[in-house]
């Protein structure tokens, strides 16, 4: 059945890299240039993709690959194989529909992408506020109230960098 | 096959204006919302102006009240008029298409321009 197929089917002795030309009686031709084939047997050569304006080219397209993109200083890859480039924001802010806008109060993101988290809300453990949250940092928990023993000296925060706030209750 | 094409640039003094064009072709420009960026050799590219197909706009916070983007879509064109030039607007400036109507957000499927220079000097 292999050797029927095969004599059926002379596309399928064609390498990646190369296509089945029907246009010259079925022999394998090489992919043009900017077009690739990945796999044995292919008809037609896939275009290969372009890493233009805020992507960059990571990886050039060979007869037998794709090229792969990655994104300019400034910018991060969202979605599979680099798909998106989205603009990169400071710490304490985060990418909205009119571009990056500081964290609201009671929220911070400490990476220059994703979004605005809400502060922990250390009562929820039983817990107490040792530091306090920015823009940029997550509160951070100390011992309850309960924890700390009569006449036992508190740790005193360090003075914040910047807005402080509270965990909201 | 798509093509985007930006002319206009050139030699302008501070507080100098210029009109950018971006002449489009290849695909349904009137449904399509496009975008203009820039590129400072060194640093990287930003977003400058983004318009969608009816015509609604967004600035960066850099070039709002100096720059306008608009569209004709009867001749398949988007602009950019730059007015009160400073320095720090000299730049290659591109036009692309803008399919994830995102701010600062651009897929792989968009489409970009060569680029125009435009250089701002006393």
């Known amino acids: 059945f292999e050797r029927t197929r095969s004599l059926q089917d002379p596309c399928s002795n064609c390498p990646a890299g190369t296509f089945c030309d029907n246009n010259r009686n079925q022999i394998c031709s090489p992919c043009p240039p900017n077009s690739f084939s990945s796999a044995g047997g292919q008809r037609t050569c896939d275009i290969c993709r372009q890493c233009k304006g805020v992507f960059r080219t990571r990886k050039e397209c060979s007869s037998t690959s794709n090229a792969e993109c990655d994104c300019t200083p400034g910018f991060h890859c969202l979605g599979a194989g680099c798909s998106m480039c989205e603009q990169d924001c400071k710490q304490g802010q985060e990418l909205t529909k009119k571009g990056c806008k500081d964290c609201c109060f009671g929220t911070f993101n400490d990476q220059k992408r994703g979004i605005c988290r809400p502060w922990t809300n250390c009562s929820l453990d039983g817990k107490s506020v040792l530091v306090n949250g920015t823009k940029e940092r997550d509160v951070v928990c100390g011992p309850s109230p309960a924890d700390l023993s009569p006449g036992a000296s508190s740790v005193t925060p360090p003075a914040p960098a910047r807005e402080p706030g509270h965990s909201p209750q | 096959e798509v093509q985007l094409v930006e002319s206009g640039g050139g030699l302008v003094q501070p507080g100098g204006s210029l009109r950018l064009s971006c002449a489009a072709s290849?695909?349904?420009?009137?449904?399509?919302?496009m975008s203009w960026a820039r590129q400072v050799p060194g640093k990287g590219f930003e977003w400058v102006a983004y318009i969608y197909s009816d015509g609604s706009t967004y600035y960066a916070d850099s070039v709002k009240g100096r720059f306008t983007i608009s569209r004709d879509n009867a001749k398949d064109t988007v602009y950019l008029h730059m007015n009160s030039l400073k320095f720090e607007d000299m730049a290659v400036y591109y036009c692309?298409?803008?399919?994830?109507?995102?701010?600062?957000?651009?897929?792989?499927?968009?489409?970009w321009g060569q680029g125009t220079q435009v250089t701002v000097s006393s």
């Open positions: 692309a298409t803008w399919r994830s109507q995102q701010v600062g957000r651009w897929d792989e499927y968009d489409h």
């Open positions: 290849g695909f349904t420009f009137s449904s399509s919302a």
